[in-house]
Interface confidence: low
């Protein structure tokens, strides 16, 4: 028996909104837990098993009921009838005169209803039960505290639109008034809570109130069903109503890809674009920069095929055959890089001669990529894969204010690069096949050492006005310089040995480099080339008028180093107080850096020739390295 | 006029008791909650007991559950909390206040009538 | 039992400045939250009720809004006489009512 009862008054309970819709029990023994007494006898004071109030309820504020439970005439004790009496408060007293309910049978058994007549919304009420004379339950309240209205009706969904993942879709639910409720003349409004969920869970998502007869509902998974229901209630008082009936929602499968969880799929969108972007890119880079991809493969170094040399000397590091062979001169002089240990080389590939088949080696190396990377240390050569080829020292003597542009440091101003005239605007012989013969490209930053040494270091030259410019001189024309051919031509060779070198080639426009603007003083470059196939760094360079064709006498060290080996030519020089050195010789050609140093470093094989700086009146002089091709090398020997 | 006045408290010994009074006029006690909410000192608001005394229904703080009985005395429109085994934790303000509205609504527990508060200290 | 989190704990304000106090329910409430305001030595005083009603008396420049189990107490224009603790309060559940820790409003 007192399972039944339990079972009933739960059902009873349940099918009870007046408690704000809470579906636990806790909170409805809080809200209303004079209605359950019988659930859990301990919360009464009076706890025996008498007739209790469930709820009271008015849909539409115009009528009202209350329904109560009838416990006692299924128990053993019969109190008689149960009747409902009920009292108004017309003013601040409540009066005592109490009155029989008007209407126990519309709202069903064990109720009672109160139609409009008996409806004061304003004034509170107090209803008793009572049996045989006695009171055995008692509540008060006002009808606007009891408004739960009917379940919304006529609910139905659209969709609103599907995500680029084909994952989520966002609906749009509507719904429409319960019939009774009148919203039009505004004597009823109603607030709504929509609830969903999927099929499978048992936890209600709830969605704030609104005053809308419709809300849209994001992020819904696609392929998963739904179920909707709304509810509402009066607003600013009264009770949520009971929930509308289940809308169920079933989002179809939009997209061709199923996942069992979302992070999977745009995973699998990232890498399937991604290998497509790759791959693009791979082509575009294949098709658009063969002559680099050549280059960085197989980077094409000149043979070193030296007349009056026996290759296998140079094969086998027979270096001092060698120094033999070039030590024709008589200002040699004994200094040697010994703790330039940073040095670093490239390695030559001797053993294919024939390797230079379609184009010139000056035409390979002007078409190295100028667009690596920048780096102040270690920059990666693109030949070897050690740090790039020569690295001159830089000395720091003579530094004027003036020489240092913007009174910043070369270091300091990596991205001072782009836009501006890099010194290797290389004359590109094949100009169709360069991308880059409008512009300059991108040239690496200064200073490029090792991480051991943080500042630079002095080349050991025959006089201090061998001095590198660390300054910055801004390029009156940048653009000027794209057709420049900075490679010495071997014009000659004396019996005596010396090798006469001729400038290099004019730009195309034909003008001379000093001829190309009027208030063109220098040529420079914002930061040392730091190229990563041949150039390793050019100091800042400026015009220098001189005669068409130099004479040079070479100077041989022996070898004292087999780790770091310099064959060292001393530099083309005239000298500093020669007069008309500074003179400009109209429509004279613009001299290039001569390459006056072989390096031989660490291997037969390193074979690398420095440019030396030419004298300037103040001092000034132009420094470069890089390689000399086969064909210019040719020559040099008899 | 709706008025609470709170009377009962004092100084007591921890393990000791204390009865509470709280006269209501203005309204009548028998169709209206009844709620007694504490504040130590310098402390917040702690809830106490409820007693809806047309029902005879009552609730209690976790804190106080077995120690503390609230109750009502509708002729003398008067609410009572009856305090044993104190403790020093008790210490507090005790106020009592009516509920706002009555049965049925969200608003049962929302308090719009308090008491001047009666002063409880429990300490040896 | 439900908890309400209340923050912050003490605010400093001036006149005229909006002020808002938040406190977050454990668990789903509905709107049974009320906002109270007290003095010191001063019994609280009802300024909000269901979360959004405006008790009898109160200034409109309280106001009280729901969020899921988020609510909002705010003042528009801090008036001289506003400066004072502020609690919520949850009337829905086992524990038939639950108090934030209180919000003191300072003058800055």
């Known amino acids: 028996m007192d399972l039944w009862q339990l079972l009933l008054t739960l059902a009873l309970a349940g099918s009870s909104d007046a408690f704000s819709g809470s579906e636990a029990t806790a909170a409805i023994l809080s809200r209303a837990p004079w209605s359950l007494q019988s659930v859990n006898p301990g919360l009464k004071t009076n706890s025996s098993k008498e007739p209790k109030f469930t709820k009271c309820r008015s849909p539409e504020r115009e009528t009202f009921s209350c329904h109560w439970t009838d416990e006692v005439h299924h128990g053993t004790k019969n109190l008689g009838p149960i009747q409902l009496f009920y009292t108004r408060r017309n003013t601040q007293e409540w009066t005592q005169e109490w009155k029989e309910c008007p209407d126990y049978v519309s709202a069903g058994e064990n109720s009672c209803y109160f139609n409009s007549s008996f409806t004061s919304i304003w004034i509170p009420y107090c209803i008793k039960l009572t049996s045989n004379g006695g009171t055995v339950d008692e509540k008060c309240f006002s009808v606007d505290e009891i408004v739960q209205p009917d379940p919304p009706i006529a609910l139905n969904w659209t969709l609103l639109n599907v995500s680029l993942t084909g994952i989520h879709a966002d609906i749009q639910v509507r719904w429409e008034a319960p019939r009774n409720a009148d919203i039009q003349k505004g004597w009823m409004v109603l607030e709504y809570e929509l609830q969903y969920k999927e099929v499978n869970e048992t936890k209600w998502k709830m969605m704030d109130p609104i005053l809308t007869t419709s809300v849209p509902v994001y992020s819904l998974k696609v392929d998963k069903e739904y179920e909707v229901r709304v509810r509402s209630k009066q607003r600013n008082s009264g009770n949520y109503g009971e929930f509308s009936e289940v809308l169920y929602v079933t989002l179809p499968q939009m997209s061709q890809f199923t996942c069992e969880e979302d992070f999977y799929f745009p995973w699998l969108l990232i890498i399937i674009f991604g290998i497509f972007g790759l791959t693009v890119m791979l082509f575009v880079f294949l098709f658009s920069k063969q002559q680099r991809i050549k280059m960085l493969i197989l980077p094409p170094v000149p043979v070193p095929k030296i007349k009056g040399i026996d290759p296998d000397l140079l094969k086998e590091g027979k270096l001092e055959e060698v120094n033999t062979i070039l030590a024709i001169h008589d200002s040699y002089k004994p200094e040697f890089h010994s703790d330039d240990s940073w040095v670093e080389f490239i390695e030559l590939d001797i053993d294919e001669p024939d390797e230079k088949t379609e184009e010139s080696d000056t035409d390979r190396l002007l078409s190295s990529d100028h667009e690596k990377s920048h780096s102040n240390l270690g920059v990666k050569d693109g030949d070897s894969g050690r740090t790039s080829c020569c690295e001159p020292d830089i000395l720091e003597t003579d530094f004027n204010a003036n020489d240092i542009h913007e009174g910043t440091s070369e270091v300091a101003q990596p991205q001072r690069l782009k836009g501006e005239a890099d010194l290797l605007c290389l004359d590109q012989k094949n100009q169709n096949n360069s991308p880059y013969h409008d512009a300059c490209p991108a040239t690496q930053q200064p200073s490029v050492i090792q991480a051991e040494k943080n500042k630079p270091q002095p080349l050991p030259t025959e006089g201090a006005e061998s001095t590198h410019q660390a300054a910055h001189i801004q390029l009156s024309n940048p653009s000027s310089l794209s057709n420049i051919d900075f490679y010495a031509q071997v014009s000659d060779i004396t019996p005596a040995g010396s090798v006469v070198l001729s400038p290099g080639q004019k730009n195309k426009a034909g003008m001379s480099q000093c001829d190309m603007h009027p208030e063109m003083v220098s040529l420079c470059q914002e930061n040392f080339l730091m190229d990563n196939a041949y150039f390793c760094e050019a100091d800042a360079k400026k015009c220098i008028p001189v005669a068409p064709h130099i004479k040079v006498e070479s100077h041989i060290q022996p070898s004292l180093n087999q780790e770091d080996i310099y064959i060292t030519t001393e530099s083309l020089t005239t000298a500093a107080g020669r007069p008309g050195t500074g003179e400009h010789v109209p429509g004279s050609e613009m001299p290039v850096p001569d390459y006056t140093s072989i390096h031989i470093v660490q291997s037969p094989q390193g074979l690398i020739l420095n440019a030396t700086a030419l004298p300037l009146p103040d001092k000034e002089f132009l420094s470069s390295c890089g390689y000399v091709s086969t064909d210019q090398l040719n020559k040099i020997m008899p | 006029e709706v008025q609470l006045v709170e009377s009962g408290g004092g100084l007591v010994q921890p393990g000791g008791s204390l009865r509470l009074s709280c006269a209501a006029s203005g309204f009548n006690v028998s169709y209206s909650s009844i709620h007694w909410v504490r504040q130590a000192p310098g402390k917040g608001l702690e809830w106490v007991a409820s007693?809806?005394?047309?029902?005879?229904?009552?609730s209690y703080a976790d804190s106080v559950k077995g120690r503390f009985t609230i109750s009502a005395d509708t002729s003398k429109n008067t609410a009572y909390l009856q305090m044993n085994s104190l403790r020093a934790e008790d210490t507090a303000v005790y106020y009592c206040?009516?509920?706002?509205?009555?049965?049925?609504?969200?608003?049962?527990?929302?308090?719009?009538?308090w008491g001047q508060g009666t002063l409880v200290t429990v300490s040896s | 039992d439900i908890q309400m989190t209340q923050s912050p704990s003490s605010l400093s304000a001036s006149v005229g400045d909006r002020v808002t106090i938040t406190c977050r329910a454990s668990q789903s409430v509905s709107s049974a939250v009320a906002w109270y305001q007290q003095k010191p030595g001063k019994a609280p005083k009802l300024l909000i009720y269901?979360?959004?009603s405006l008790y009898s008396g109160v200034p409109s420049r309280f106001s009280g809004s729901r969020s899921g189990t988020d609510f909002t107490l705010t003042i528009s224009s801090l008036q001289p006489e506003d400066f004072a603790t502020y609690y919520c309060?949850?009337?829905?559940?086992?524990?038939?009512?639950?108090f934030g820790q209180g919000t003191k409003v300072e003058i800055k």
């Open positions: 206040a009516r509920g706002y509205m009555y049965w049925w609504s969200y608003y049962n527990g929302a308090i719009d009538y």
């Open positions: 309060q949850q009337y829905e559940g086992s524990s038939l009512i639950t």
């Open positions: 269901s979360a959004s």
């Open positions: 007693i809806y005394s047309y029902s005879g229904y009552t």
